[in-house]
Amino acid sequence: MAVTACQGLGFVVSLIGIAGIIAATCMDQWSTQDLYNNPVTAVFNYQGLWRSCVRESSGFTECRGYFTLLGLPAMLQAVRALMIVGIVLGAIGLLVSIFALKCIRIGSMEDSAKANMTLTSGIMFIVSGLCAIAGVSVFANMLVTNFWMSTANMYTGMGGMVQTVQTRYTFGAALFVGWVAGGLTLIGGVMMCIACRGLAPEETNYKAVSYHASGHSVAYKPGGFKASTGFGSNTKNKKIYDGGARTEDEVQSYPSKHDYV
């Protein structure tokens, strides 16, 4: 039961996280005009990954897309790439995890296959979350650098009579949405990986097949391959040697813990 809950919760948390990453990527408020010195402004500037906007105090808002690709800063392109990779990986992860959910039955899919898919989606969510966090952090670092550069510029070249107001930009709402969403996706991915450990059967409940060989009989007992998860050891795939052959009914079958879910 705990495994199903962990997997389900991981899926839901990741779903919310990826929705947040998509929202952050689409949002226009990645950077917003710093209003520290002037809390009420007649013209308010804010920028996103795809366009920049100006909101006038009278209610008029105008947004203009970045119609150039080559003219954009490399860092902005990198952030775009990280966010898109995060979304794509997250979307694929969601698709895979839907089929991996223990509560959803698809044909005669074995637990080992579900464990595999759960792990795959978990890793995808982790990478997706890391991409989002990295993208947002790179943008935030860019903002901090530019903020202090423009602050320095504000106090230079003021010798003339005419003042030129330098617009400084600070963290926009999208950055916080991105950080939280990336974190949620990461947590969801970790939960999926934890759920995978529980999904991988330690002992399958197949009946052992007896092979009557010449000499003393050897019964091969198929073990629980951990779906190549790397969690635990594969020593369960052991041969059972005893003095004679057993009937199928005599061979003890170890129930999987998931038989009770």
Partner: antibody, heavy 118, light 113 residues
Amino acid sequence: QVQLQESGPGLVKPSETLSLTCTVSGYSITSNYAWNWIRQPPGKGLEWIGYINYSGNTNYNPSLKSRVTISRDTSKNQFSLKLSSVTAADTAVYYCATSYYGNSFIYWGQGTLVTVSS
Amino acid sequence: DIVMTQSPDSLAVSLGERATINCKSSQSLLNSGNQKNYLTWYQQKPGQPPKLLIYWASTRESGVPDRFSGSGSGTDFTLTISSLQAEDVAVYYCQNAYSFPWTFGQGTKVEIK
């Protein structure tokens, strides 16, 4: 077409409160735009008093801020100006105006002359 | 506050001639976010409210004749009437629309010579 019409007393005594109302037709004051008050002393230039925007936020000229209140009545589609402790220097033609793109005043009322005199 | 200074205070131009009014602001009115100058021009005829002519320093309001044009950037702006008509006799005001409080120039009176 947005139309604005100022109304209020044309004569106010010194130290009293000047009250004017602007009735808007052809547009809802809660839809968009900022709704401004501007004044013009006889034979002089224009002075922006302040505004109330579509969401109800106000902004005033610092030189008048301590004496000015701009409010609105959405049910009547009106906004109002109150200027307290008036003096002869407050004698002017008072205009209500709508600002939008470029923070420019696109629609104006005809104006109402308010004289401050005892 | 941003101080707006217009020159000249009055201007007499012959019909059909060019009229040029200058406006200077004490601070730049250029917004870096959209590269627009937040300067507006108005025309006021006697006994009437002002009428919007030009916003964003050079964008003509709909219905305004194309003989009116605005130019300039930063702190220096110009309103040009390419061919003065009798109906253009009025007082012209520039306005800072960039920074609160919104302020107006003292006005330039245009007359026919």
